[in-house]
Interface confidence: medium
């Protein structure tokens, strides 16, 4: 599998409509929780929780602050932590508790605390519960949590130093935790947790399971340096711990290695960055998408692998276990365990079969089973990805977060659209197209190129958004910028399953937002632009330039995958010739203008899609070079002239192949501004041309003129 290509289109922050939320002096907007039924996005930041309108996040609806007392700050600083940054309250857990409350935990100046947030009054109830084991002490430490039926399952560190990892369930009747032992958790970096509900019609009366994803230091591979391993672990919701062995500890904790590698090249991605569980009506079993980087990532590599949950279940239900053996010098080595496995199967959830054998709860499990799972939490079998290879491998980028949306194209094909954020504040949107990856677009979400810390996807029909949290704020972006594709070709070549061309309105429309039936819409995921109707009207722009000057002709081709070339009077121009130059890879510069340069210039783009090359006329310019006598300006009016040589531009509509919409007149050079008089300058004798000066270039004005000095080059 080859590396993914560059994104086809790059949208700068200012180019697209992005809604932003940030509050002065509030940072680290890293906890996001969406309430779809209330159209509310809850945002946990440093020392604050906000509720904003999910359809327009700039509209703040509620706010509550949870600050650290000066006394607590001082105590924290005494322990060597920074009073300005670390000794504050970073909200790390933001989970739904009931219809009217949230469960919120914060680092609280290295004394983690939890509270209930009443959504009616938007006030904390002041419970001030100990957050140990639910929330990290250190804002820099990893954490993950999920609320399951009113009980918080979390993965974090249990002490001030962050040296004791824990996966726990906070429950009034049955709190459970992992053993503090290297075979269970070895310096883990927690990434994600979620509950997978057993289907109601499941025949074996199985339990809901809670899955944890993390990267930890390997126990099974021994090298000179510490090898990191990505893991999937799971516990059973019904687990109540053991009666004597594993009392108040998980009896169902099992973990396995996640494989994400490129077999042909030996590329192994072993650091897990994020996980997204894709649930869709069309999916019998959820699919989880995992984002990885290699351990030694000096080239900026990232990969996405997708896994069927049933593959993981199979490993836990029927896979072989690993066992530690002591070799010379009390050195521990982990190998496959081939001996007898006690019954009931160690680590299994209590199902109908266990209940039939009178094991109605984990408290009834025999010591043999419990001792075995205590000593053998690691599976020998690994969880392998769908198709045994990554969905995407990208070079020169560090991906940080992933969300995935399953959508149906116009032809009925289902696509998993991956939205992946980067450590430079961008969002990539990618799909798999016939075993190749197509990165539809890259959107610069954050102007300051800061890492995206959290990504969230709304699943409500109609208004669909991606929400991204960073240190400075939250950004809301639509799933597609269909309207930005100005022509049918652009719309089709985007190969965006959310977008289709609507011939009646001559616009690229978002499929999920069109109420009307999709009849007549054009979408071709193969990128075959020949399906587009013939253009009846295109536009060309007429320019008048002065003899001896320089002209710059614009060509706004957004595609990064297209090659741009220019034609003059139907002959292809060589940009290398001293007469011509390319500016910004696309705009044509013509030097030392003479009458022979008058004529029609066409900017064409050539884009390779599959085995076809698609040609498009992107812009058409009609250039006329004239010898124009210098206008006489009345002494009372000053016209500040700038370098350049264009004296007029007209936009005309004509029958051409190009179909770009007319754009405002462009400057011949970018070398400064023109100061224009308040009224048209009075001209001298009658033999000189009358020059009309408009301060704002109008698209269809008969004359939009600029006064320029002659070019002395």
């Amino acid at each position: 599998m080859a590396f993914a290509p560059i994104p086809r289109i790059t949208w700068e922050h200012r180019e697209v409509h992005l809604v932003q939320f940030h509050e002065p002096d509030i940072y680290n907007y890293s906890a996001l929780l969406l309430s779809e039924d209330k159209d509310t996005l809850y945002i946990g930041a440093r020392e604050a929780v906000f509720a904003v309108n999910a359809l327009n996040i700039s509209e703040k609806q509620h706010e509550v602050y949870w600050k650290v007392s000066e006394d607590k700050k001082a105590k924290c600083a005494e322990k060597g932590k920074s009073k300005q940054t670390e000794c504050l309250n970073y909200i790390r857990v933001l989970q739904p508790l009931s219809a009217t409350s949230l469960y919120v935990c914060g680092t609280n100046a290295f004394q983690p605390a939890c509270d209930h947030l009443n959504l009616t009054s938007f006030k904390f109830l002041g419970k001030n519960e100990d957050g140990k084991g639910r929330c990290p002490f250190d804002p820099a430490h990893s954490y993950t949590s999920v609320m399951v039926d009113g009980e918080l399952y979390s993965g974090t560190s249990y002490n001030f130093l962050g040296s004791e990892p824990i996966i726990s369930r906070n429950s009034s009747h049955s709190p459970l935790r992992t053993e503090y032992a290297i075979p269970w958790l070895n310096e883990p970096s927690f990434v994600f947790a979620d509950v997978i509900r057993k289907s109601p019609d499941s025949p074996d009366g199985e339990d809901d399971r809670v899955y944890f994803f993390f990267t930890e230091v390997s126990v099974e591979y021994e090298f000179v340096f510490r090898v990191l391993i990505p893991r999937i672990a799971r516990v059973c919701k019904g687990d109540q711990g053991g009666l004597r062995t594993l009392q108040k500890k998980w009896t169902s904790f099992l973990k396995a290695r996640l494989i994400c590698s490129r077999p042909d090249s030996g590329l192994v991605f072993n650091v897990l960055r994020d996980v997204f569980v894709l649930r869709s009506p069309g999916l019998k079993v959820p699919v989880f998408y995992a984002l990885f980087t290699p351990q030694l990532n000096n080239v900026g590599l990232s990969a996405v692998c997708a896994y069927n949950l049933s593959t993981a279940e199979e490993v836990f239900s029927h896979g072989k276990y690993m066992q530690s053996t002591t070799v010379e010098q009390s050195h521990t080595k982990w190998v496959r365990y081939n001996g007898p496995v006690p019954k009931p199967r160690p680590g299994a959830c209590i199902d109908s079969e266990a209940r039939a054998a009178n094991y109605t709860s984990s408290l009834n499990l025999p010591d043999k089973t419990l001792q075995f799972v205590k000593d053998h939490p690691l599976m020998d079998d690994s969880v392998t990805p769908i198709d045994n290879r990554p969905r995407l491998i990208k070079k020169d980028v560090n991906y940080t977060q992933i969300v995935v949306d399953r959508t149906q194209a116009l032809d009925g094909t289902v696509y998993d659209v991956m939205f992946v954020s980067t450590d430079r504040g961008a969002l990539h949107k990618a799909i798999s197209l016939e075993h190749a990856v197509h990165i539809i677009e890259e959107t610069q979400l954050f102007q300051d190129f800061e890492p995206v810390q959290t990504l969230l996807l709304s699943s409500k029909k109609g208004n669909r958004f991606v929400y991204a949290g960073s240190n400075s704020g939250v950004v809301q972006a639509p799933l597609a910028f269909c309207g930005k594709h100005g022509t049918c070709e652009d719309c089709v070549l985007a190969r965006d399953p959310y977008c289709a061309w609507s011939p009646p309105t001559a616009t690229c429309v978002a499929l999920h937002q069109t109420e009307s039936p999709s009849r007549g819409l054009i979408q071709e995921m193969s990128g075959d632009a020949s399906v587009c109707p013939d253009k009846s009207k295109g536009s060309y722009r007429q320019h008048f330039f002065k003899h001896g000057g320089t002209a710059e002709l614009k060509c706004s081709q957004k595609s990064n995958l297209a090659r741009v070339f220019w034609k003059f009077q139907n002959g292809v121009l060589k940009a290398e010739s001293p007469k011509y130059g390319l500016m910004g890879r696309k705009n044509l510069l013509i030097f030392n203008l003479s009458e022979g340069d008058s004529g029609v210039y066409q900017c064409l783009s050539e884009e390779r899609v599959k085995n076809k090359t698609v040609f498009q006329v992107v812009a058409k310019h009609v250039l006329e070079v004239k010898v124009v006598p210098k206008p006489v300006v009345a002494p009372t009016l000053s016209v500040v002239q700038t370098e350049g040589s264009r004296i007029a531009t007209k936009v005309l509509v004509a029958s051409t192949q190009g179909s770009s919409p007319p754009t405002p007149a462009v400057q011949a050079t970018s070398s400064g501004a023109i100061t224009l008089p308040p009224k048209p300058a009075p001209t001298g004798t009658s033999c000189e041309p009358k020059i009309v000066i408009n301060t704002v270039p109008q698209l269809h004005s008969e004359k939009t003129m600029y006064l320029k000095s002659s070019d002395n080059r």
Partner: antibody, heavy 118, light 110 residues
Amino acid sequence: QVQLQQPGAELVRPGSSVKLSCKASGHTLTGFWMHWVRQRPIPGLEWIGNIDPSDSETHYNQKFEDKATLTVDKSSNTAYMLLSSLTSEDSAVYYCAREGGTGYFDVWGTGTTVTVSS
Amino acid sequence: EFVLTQSPTTLAASPGEKITITCSASSSISSNYLHWYQQKPGFSPKLLIYRTSNLASGVPARFSGSGSGTSYSLTIGTMEAEDVATYYCQKGSSIPRMYTFGGGTKLEIK
């Protein structure tokens, strides 16, 4: 059953003050914002302000900032609104109402008709 | 200043008729924050619909609400004599905290 009981009417002199009460029964005040709303034929219903009975945090409509003062007595489960410097313009029906969530009032008081007259 | 404009201000209808009252916001709001009340003569207002389309408890199913952005509406599927009242739309809390009511629509019987 949740109810908010208010006295039926108050007759007061211009320039004086009046303290309106709103007693909750069937639920405690804490955990819900308690609001006060004024109703006159024109302009209709107007929001005056709200109070959180648990810690007495208040918010006022700017228009009523110098007119109304909201308080609460948790022990008697009663919310109060003090209206000061009364003029004939303040003659209206005043309702207390409980907020049920995203700014909607699910329980309304019976209303007190205030008449300012010399 | 944020304003909710209701139309019509008065409406006379016969029992069995379908009634629609509209509420227009001066700027876009979340559907989560738009609510409707019914006030019968001599009584306190009563919550009818909350969050644009959710019926308050005890409200007959002939009442429904819809809308988004700046345009919202209350519909009575088939009017009954007991529906004679004034109907108000209201925008709920947002920051800064300000709760705004529409001017009201008086529904009378023909």
